[in-house]
Interface confidence: low
C-alpha cells in the first residue's frame, strides 16, 4: 500500500486546515494508528495527535481543542485531521506516520502554509499644488504573508516606486505614487490595488486628488463701453476666476472708496443708476489658501450730453 497526502496545504489565517493522510492499502489491510507530529527542521518532532483505531483520538496538550477528526462518515483507512483556526505560527512541516497490519509503517510529510491577507492603508501625501515638480500624491502600505502586490489604478499620469520590508513571518510592501500636479487632476480618483493569494478579490482603496491652484482673474461687463452711460440701470462687473479651494472675491476701488449704492455680491459688483461718480479704477482681488490674483478695469461713465456736444462742435468746425 501507499500513503496519499499533499505536498502543500494552504489555508488563510483563521481557517481550518485539513491535513490529509489516507492509506491506500491492499484488500484486507488495516490501519492500527496514525500519529501526527510537527517536524520543522531543527525543532525536533512535536506530537500533535494520535488517532487509534480502537481508542479514538488523543490530542497532545499543546494542541488541546485545536485538532479534530473530520466529520463523519469516516473511512477507517483515513488518518486525516483538522487543525482548527490556523495561525501564522502553525506554518511549517507536518508528518503523518501510519501503522498498518500486516504491511507495517508508512510515513509522509506535508507543508502547511498559512496565508495572512493584508489590511491595506492609504496615506495621502502632502498638499498638492499646481506648479510643483514630481510630488508624492499618496502611499499605500499592505503587510501580509506572502508579500502582497501593491499597484495603482488611475487615469492620472504618474510614476510609482515600491519598497518592501521583510519581517520574520510576513512582508510589508509600500508603494508610492508620484505625479506632477495640475488642475486637470482635481477630483480624479487614485486607487491603490492590493492583490494577495489570501484575498478572494483585490482590495481597492480610492483617494480623490485635490490640487490647489488659482487661475488668472479677469473682469467681464465692460465689453461694450457705450453701455456705461449716465442713468443706465443694472450695470455690473463680474470677476472671473477659478480655483481649488474655491476662491473668495473682494472688490475695491483704486482711486478711492467704493461709491455709495454700489453692491458687492461675491464675484459681482452691482451699480445703482450710473453717474459720473462711478467712473474710476476697480480692482477685483481673488484669493484662496494657495494664492491670490488681481485684475483691474477702468470704468468711464459716458455723459450723452457731452458726447452730443462734441459732435456738434466737430460738425461746426468742419
Amino acid at each position: 500500500g501507499e500513503l496519499e497526502t499533499s505536498d502543500v496545504v494552504t489555508v488563510v489565517l483563521g481557517q481550518d486546515a485539513k491535513l490529509p493522510c489516507f492509506y491506500r492499502g491492499d484488500s484486507g489491510e488495516q490501519v492500527g494508528q496514525v500519529a501526527w507530529a510537527r517536524v520543522d527542521a531543527g525543532e525536533g518532532a512535536q506530537e500533535l495527535a494520535l488517532l487509534h483505531s480502537k481508542y479514538g483520538l488523543h490530542v497532545s496538550p499543546a494542541y488541546e481543542g485545536r485538532v479534530e477528526q473530520p466529520p463523519p462518515p469516516r473511512n477507517p483507512l483515513d488518518g486525516s485531521v483538522l487543525l482548527r483556526n490556523a495561525v501564522q505560527a502553525d506554518e511549517g512541516e507536518y508528518e503523518c506516520r501510519v501503522s498498518t497490519f500486516p504491511a507495517g509503517s508508512f510515513q509522509a510529510r506535508l507543508r502547511l502554509r498559512v496565508l495572512v491577507p493584508p489590511l491595506p492603508s492609504l496615506n495621502p501625501g502632502p498638499a498638492l499644488e499646481e506648479g510643483q515638480g514630481l510630488t508624492l500624491a499618496a502611499s499605500c502600505t499592505a503587510e501580509g504573508s506572502p508579500a502582497p502586490s501593491v499597484t495603482w489604478d488611475t487615469e492620472v499620469k504618474g510614476t510609482t516606486s515600491s519598497r518592501s520590508f521583510k519581517h520574520s513571518r510576513s512582508a510589508a510592501v509600500t508603494s508610492e505614487f508620484h505625479l506632477v500636479p495640475s488642475r486637470s487632476m482635481n477630483g480624479q480618483p487614485l486607487t491603490c490595488v492590493v492583490s494577495h493569494p489570501g484575498l478572494l478579490q483585490d482590495q481597492r482603496i480610492t483617494h480623490i486628488l485635490h490640487v490647489s491652484f488659482l487661475a488668472e482673474a479677469s473682469v467681464r461687463g465692460l465689453e461694450d463701453q457705450n453701455l456705461w452711460h449716465i442713468g443706465r440701470e443694472g450695470a455690473m462687473l463680474k470677476c472671473l476666476s477659478e480655483g481649488q479651494p474655491p476662491p473668495s472675491y473682494n472688490w475695491t476701488r483704486l482711486d478711492g472708496p467704493l461709491p455709495s449704492g454700489v453692491r458687492v455680491d461675491g464675484d459681482t459688483l452691482g451699480f445703482p443708476p450710473l453717474t459720473t461718480e462711478h467712473s474710476g479704477i476697480y480692482v477685483c482681488h481673488v484669493s484662496n489658501e494657495f494664492s491670490s490674483r488681481d485684475s483691474q478695469v477702468t470704468v468711464d461713465v459716458l455723459d450723452p450730453q457731452e458726447d452730443s456736444g462734441k459732435q456738434v462742435d466737430l460738425v461746426s468746425a468742419s
Epitope: 514630481l134 499597484t151 510609482t160 510592501v173 508603494s175 506632477v180
Partner: antibody, heavy 115, light 111 residues
Framework: EVLLQQSGPELVKPGASVKIPCKAS????????MDWVKQSHGKSLEWIGD????????MYNEKFKGRATLTVDKSSSTAYMEVRSLTSEDTAVYYC????????WGQGTLVTVSA | DIVLTQSPASLIVSLGQRATISCRAS??????????MHWYQQKPGQPPKLLIR???NLESGVPARFSGSGSGTYFTLNIHPVEEEDSATYYC?????????FGGGTKLEIK
C-alpha cells in the same frame, strides 16, 4: 562598490529581437529602479524607461512603448531590456543606469542592426 | 515632452580659462526649493558621468572647478579653470516628469 555589468556587442538582423542583460552588484538590487538609456552614434542620449525590481512596475518613454520590454530577475540581481522588430534606427549603445540620480552606469552594449 | 536646448553645440577654450555651457528648458523644471536639472560629462568610449545634481549640487569626487547654477528654464554649467582632462561632451538632463530628456550635448575642446 556599485557595478552594473552589461554583455558584449550584438549584431542582429532587421526585424529580429535583442535582449540585453545588466547584472547589478554592490547594492541592494530592489532598493533602486533600473533605467535604460539609448545613445546612437555621435548623438545625444534618450531615456527608454525604468523598472522597479520590487514589483516589476515599469515606466516607458512613449517613443519606445510596445517595442521595448524591461524585466528583472531578482534572484540574480539582473535587469533585462528586450527590443523587438529592430531596424537600422535601433543601432546604438544601450546603457543600464541605476535610478534615483543617474550616478552609476553600465559600460554600455553596442547593438548593430544590419542585414 | 520637455525639450532641452544646449548652447553652444561646440566650444574651444584655452587652458586655464572659463568654459560656460547653457541649457534652456521648454518649460520650468523648478519648484521654490529644487531645480530638477542635472549635468553629465561623457568622454569617447565611456558612459556619461554625473557631475552636478539638482542644478548646483556637486557630485562626490567631482573637482570644485565645476559649478552649476540656474532655475526655472535657464541653467548653466561653468568650468574654471579648464584643464586638459575636461575635454569631453557635456549633457544636461531633467527629471521633472516622464519621459526624462537630455540636451543635445556641448563638445568642449581645450587648446
Amino acid at each position: 562598490e556599485v557595478l552594473l555589468q552589461q554583455s558584449g556587442p550584438e549584431l542582429v538582423k532587421p526585424g529580429a529581437s535583442v535582449k540585453i542583460p545588466c547584472k547589478a552588484s554592490g547594492y541592494t538590487f530592489t532598493d533602486y529602479t533600473m533605467d535604460w538609456v539609448k545613445q546612437s552614434h555621435g548623438k545625444s542620449l534618450e531615456w527608454i524607461g525604468d523598472i522597479n525590481p520590487n514589483n516589476d512596475v515599469t515606466m516607458y518613454n512613449e517613443k519606445f512603448k510596445g517595442r521595448a520590454t524591461l524585466t528583472v530577475d531578482k534572484s540574480s540581481s539582473t535587469a533585462y531590456m528586450e527590443v523587438r522588430s529592430l531596424t537600422s534606427e535601433d543601432t546604438a549603445v544601450y546603457y543600464c543606469v541605476r535610478g534615483r540620480g543617474f550616478a552609476y552606469w553600465g559600460q554600455g552594449t553596442l547593438v548593430t542592426v544590419s542585414a | 515632452d520637455i525639450v532641452l536646448t544646449q548652447s553652444p553645440a561646440s566650444l574651444i577654450v584655452s587652458l586655464g580659462q572659463r568654459a560656460t555651457i547653457s541649457c534652456r528648458a521648454s518649460q520650468s523644471v523648478s519648484t521654490s526649493s529644487n531645480s530638477y536639472m542635472h549635468w553629465y560629462q561623457q568622454k569617447p568610449g565611456q558612459p556619461p558621468k554625473l557631475l552636478i545634481r539638482f542644478a548646483s549640487n556637486l557630485e562626490s569626487g567631482v573637482p570644485a572647478r565645476f559649478s552649476g547654477s540656474g532655475s526655472g528654464t535657464y541653467f548653466t554649467l561653468n568650468i574654471h579653470p579648464v584643464e586638459e582632462e575636461d575635454s569631453a561632451t557635456y549633457y544636461c538632463q531633467h527629471s521633472w516628469e516622464i519621459p526624462y530628456t537630455f540636451g543635445g550635448g556641448t563638445k568642449l575642446e581645450i587648446k
